[in-house]
């Protein structure tokens, strides 16, 4: 190989070892029988060399740096050439570096021809291996503007006081043009301006200078977005950190053409604007940092450009002004990420502040709209707390657990509506009475309705899940000792049509000691399946639950247990079951940790089933499943 660099070309070529490899044999640059691992060639030098191996690209890289001085003479503006031509260089991974030094008052603009650039974050790489690393200068300090691949939206980068552009080409890449030109501009009075052009729908992820390290103190950086007028843009911050400011405040400013409030100033922690039509600018402004503990300012954000959806012009009013202790969250439902571009799905407050999730709180009227191609990608979760603090005032008071119609009218599927029901400890208990009798969901008889009620304890230390219940069964009411959460969970869009079947009333009643009491009034010809709470994890220690099972006078009930033994092993105490006839008070007591479970038994009158747990050893829990079936009496035994 021979490399000859013209005098006054201000080009230096450096061949050096690349990333360490586990290759068995080293490779050297050979110059007049001397074996070396680094070769530097300066302007005006001509050097002939060879490599001591067949595949030098596995060992060496080549850097070609051209210094362009715009301080002492005219600047060579226009299209930048690759010099020396790639055909004259050994086939090594190559990095062309252009280091342009200019006065502070001179603006320099890098213009990228098609394909435009796409910024990548730390740890990311470009599919074709071609990367553009761009840095600027503040006095003597180098500032990294970013690393970019091809096929993006970045068309121009403006800087002042100098720019360093490094183009990395893999040894096998045929590219023989730089793909950019340099133009001079008036001073931009900031660190840099990055222009990002969208031709159609798409997204761009961009980062503050020096990311993931800190943005330079008290600097200003601007991104200009060129967006076709018929499309909408939304900004979301993916990652940010704030530094410790001594003077001024870190902020982002939006300049939105046509807005009467330009510039619109936002804190980094605010929800950022969405649903913007046409071009806009975003600027990041740093502050004067605390010298002792500066912290770091950094920002990574995404701009999503897409067609406005039909829904985006429709305003929905969610009136929560008469509600108390309630919050409504609209958020993306969990989905597997696909690799192709997926338009964003945003919910907007007052049509401007758009984000992928939004929480509305009680006490206000909210106006929302959607910027989303497919509203099935979103769902709603609502939480409402009904609490009683004064037992004298609450006793016998009732509340309807009903999803408000305002919420049902939204074009987004309701996922969960949770009521947290709180009572004063040891003073009051709760009773749930459904509009339609409930069925307990079991493997043997699963619910197939569009919604269910999930009933669980709301006491933080207590792990007690009573079960999942849906309309169309035999459970007339559920009484619970203390705080619970009742969650209406929907399973199908048809819930909108079946919403009339929902309806649950909660009343505060005098305190009782049992954890729960289920009142069951079986219908004839249907088998009722019932199971102990906490089915998968076992009834909690020392917990007692009862079922009050009604038997009509012309019927007989068959009580069947689905195991021979309960399987519970007690560490302390005893686990027992009492089956008690309500009319005669006659009762049978079974030791669940010793006895076999009773064979199917027939009951001609209403009866109780009470199950009380011991403190079981781990892994030997108490789980019971039983059924009640009514059949007509053939002989009157009374």
């Amino acid at each position: 190989f021979e490399i000859a660099l013209p005098r006054e070309s201000n080009i230096t070529v450096l061949i050096k070892l690349g990333t360490p490899t586990l290759l068995a044999k080293p490779c050297y640059i050979v110059i007049s029988k001397r074996h070396i691992t680094m070769l530097s060639i300066k302007s005006g030098e001509r050097i002939v060399f060879t490599f001591s191996c067949q595949s030098p690209e596995n060992h060496f890289v080549i850097e070609i740096q051209k210094n362009i001085d715009c301080m002492s003479g005219p600047c060579p503006f226009g299209e930048v050439q690759l010099q020396p031509s790639t055909s004259l260089l050994p086939t090594l991974n190559r990095t062309f570096i252009w280091d342009v030094k200019a006065h502070k008052s001179i603006g320099l603009e890098l213009q990228f021809s098609i394909p435009r650039l796409r910024q990548i974050g730390p740890g990311e790489s470009c599919p074709d291996g071609v990367t553009h690393s761009i840095s600027g200068r503040i006095d003597a300090t180098v500032v990294r503007i970013g690393t970019f691949c091809s096929n993006g939206t970045v068309s121009r980068i403006k800087m002042q006081e100098g720019v360093k552009m490094a183009l990395h080409l893999p040894w096998f890449h045929p590219r023989n043009v730089s793909g950019f030109s340099i133009a001079n501009r008036s001073s931009i009075k900031r660190l840099c301006i990055i222009e990002s052009v969208f031709e159609g729908e798409g997204s761009a992820t961009l980062m503050s200078a020096n990311y993931p390290e800190g943005f330079p103190e008290d600097e200003l950086m601007t991104w200009q977005f060129v967006v076709p007028a018929h499309l909408r843009a939304s900004v979301s911050f993916l990652n940010f950190n704030l530094s410790n400011c001594e003077r001024k405040e870190e902020r982002v400013e939006y300049y939105i053409p046509g807005s009467t409030t330009n510039p619109e100033v936002f804190k980094l922690e605010d929800k950022q604007p969405g649903n913007m039509a046409g071009n806009f600018n975003l600027s990041l402004q740093g502050c004067d940092q605390d010298a002792q503990s500066p912290g770091i300012l950094r920002l990574q954000f995404q701009v999503l450009v897409q067609h406005p959806q039909n829904e985006s012009n429709k305003i929905y009013v969610v009136d929560l002004s008469n509600e108390r202790a309630m919050s409504l969250t609209i958020e993306p439902r969990p989905v597997k990420q696909s690799r192709k571009f997926v338009p964003g799905c945003f919910v907007c407050l007052e049509s401007r502040t758009c984000s992928s999730n939004l929480t509305l709180t009680s006490g206000s009227k909210h106006k929302i709209s959607f910027l989303c191609d497919d509203l099935t990608r979103l769902w709603m979760n609502v939480e409402k707390t009904i609490s009683c603090t004064d037992h004298r005032y609450c006793q016998r008071k009732s509340y309807s657990l009903q999803v408000p119609s305002d919420i049902l009218h939204l074009p987004v599927e309701l996922h969960d509506f949770s009521w947290k029901l709180l009572v004063p400890k040891d003073r009051l208990s709760l009773v749930l009475v459904p509009a339609q009798k409930l069925q307990q969901h079991t493997h043997e008889k699963p619910c197939n309705t569009s919604f269910s009620y999930l009933v669980a304890s709301a006491i933080p230390s207590q792990d007690l899940y009573f079960g999942s219940f849906c309309p169309g069964g035999s459970i007339k009411q559920i009484q619970v000792k203390q705080n619970i959460s009742v969650t209406l969970r929907t399973f199908a869009p048809s819930f909108q049509q079946e919403a009339s079947r929902q309806g649950l009333t909660v009343s505060f009643i005098p305190y009782f000691k049992e954890e729960g009491v289920f009142t069951v009034t079986p219908d004839t010809k249907s088998k009722v399946y019932l199971r102990t709470p906490n089915w998968d994890r076992g009834l909690p220690s020392l917990t007692s639950v009862s079922w009050n099972i009604s038997v009509p006078r012309d019927q007989v009930a068959c009580l069947t247990f689905f195991k021979e033994r309960s399987g519970v092993v007690c560490q302390t105490g005893r686990a027992f079951m009492i089956i008690q006839e309500q009319r005669t008070r006659a009762e049978e007591i079974f030791s669940l940790d010793e006895d076999v479970l009773p064979k199917p038994s027939f009951h001609h009158h209403s009866f109780w089933v009470n199950i009380s747990n011991c403190s079981p050893t781990s892994g030997k829990q108490l789980d019971l499943l039983f059924s009640v079936t009514l059949t007509p009496r053939t002989v009157d035994l009374t």
Partner: antibody, heavy 116, light 108 residues
Framework: EVQLVESGGGLVQPGGSLRLSCAAS????????IHWVRQAPGKGLEWVAS????????SYADSVKGRFTISADTSKNTAYLQMNSLRAEDTAVYYC?????????WGQGTLVTVSS | DIQMTQSPSSLSASVGDRVTITCRAS??????VAWYQQKPGKAPKLLIY???SLYSGVPSRFSGSRSGTDFTLTISSLQPEDFATYYC??????????FGQGTKVEIK
């Protein structure tokens, strides 16, 4: 696994001689530059000599030129440093190092003490 | 011979600090500079080669840079295991190899 093990250090009188060995394993010594670097007690690092046995290339620091000789036996995958006319200022821990990405592998060192 | 003037000769720092050590070459050595870490009683370990290339297995908090004949080793966030002595070294072409005098990084 690449390893370098020095041996041959010890106490020697001024004017005396000593031969240090550097046994290499895990790589072929003839493909690489081997260097000797020394460190006097409490002082910094000082390069002494180097050899690239494939082309019989050797090089020495001015302070040892004419007194020290670097060599290698590729069949034994071992490099040597023959030290003659030793002086008190040659007292140091002597390291051998393999060079490619800089001095990427070093031996544990052997102590040479020149004293009467 | 090419002199490598290393500064400071010692410094005190705390865990988490950003530490910078510089070496100035008495004449151009291109990028033929390496940085080493040495702990008492142990052989030196290679950190950086070719002025700015991180050697394999070395934590990414270590970085090297070059500006003309000035070379810098930076530890972005000092860890307890980083307290040691650091040396720069030039190995430019036909010149004898030379080391800097060393910088001892101590706990503040």
């Amino acid at each position: 696994e690449v390893q370098l093990v020095e041996s041959g250090g010890g106490l020697v009188q001024p004017g005396g001689s000593l031969r240090l060995s550097c046994a290499a394993s895990g790589f072929n010594l003839s493909y690489y530059y081997i260097h000797w670097v020394r460190q006097a007690p409490g002082k910094g690092l000082e390069w002494v000599a180097s050899i690239y046995s494939s082309s019989s290339y050797t090089s020495y620091a001015d302070s040892v030129k004419g007194r020290f000789t670097i060599s290698a036996d590729t069949s034994k995958n071992t490099a040597y440093l023959q030290m003659n006319s030793l002086r008190a200022e040659d007292t140091a821990v002597y390291y051998c190092a393999r060079a490619y990405y800089g001095f990427d592998y070093w031996g544990q060192g052997t102590l040479v003490t020149v004293s009467s | 011979d090419i002199q490598m003037t290393q500064s400071p000769s010692s410094l005190s720092a705390s865990v988490g600090d950003r530490v910078t050590i510089t070496c100035r070459a008495s004449q151009s050595v291109s990028s033929a500079v390496a940085w080493y870490q040495q702990k008492p009683g142990k052989a030196p370990k290679l950190l950086i080669y070719s002025a700015s290339s991180l050697y394999s297995g070395v934590p990414s908090r270590f970085s090297g840079s070059r500006s003309g004949t000035d070379f810098t080793l930076t530890i972005s966030s000092l860890q307890p295991e980083d307290f040691a002595t650091y040396y720069c070294q030039q190995s430019y072409y036909y010149y004898p190899i030379t080391f800097g005098q060393g910088t001892k990084v101590e706990i503040k």
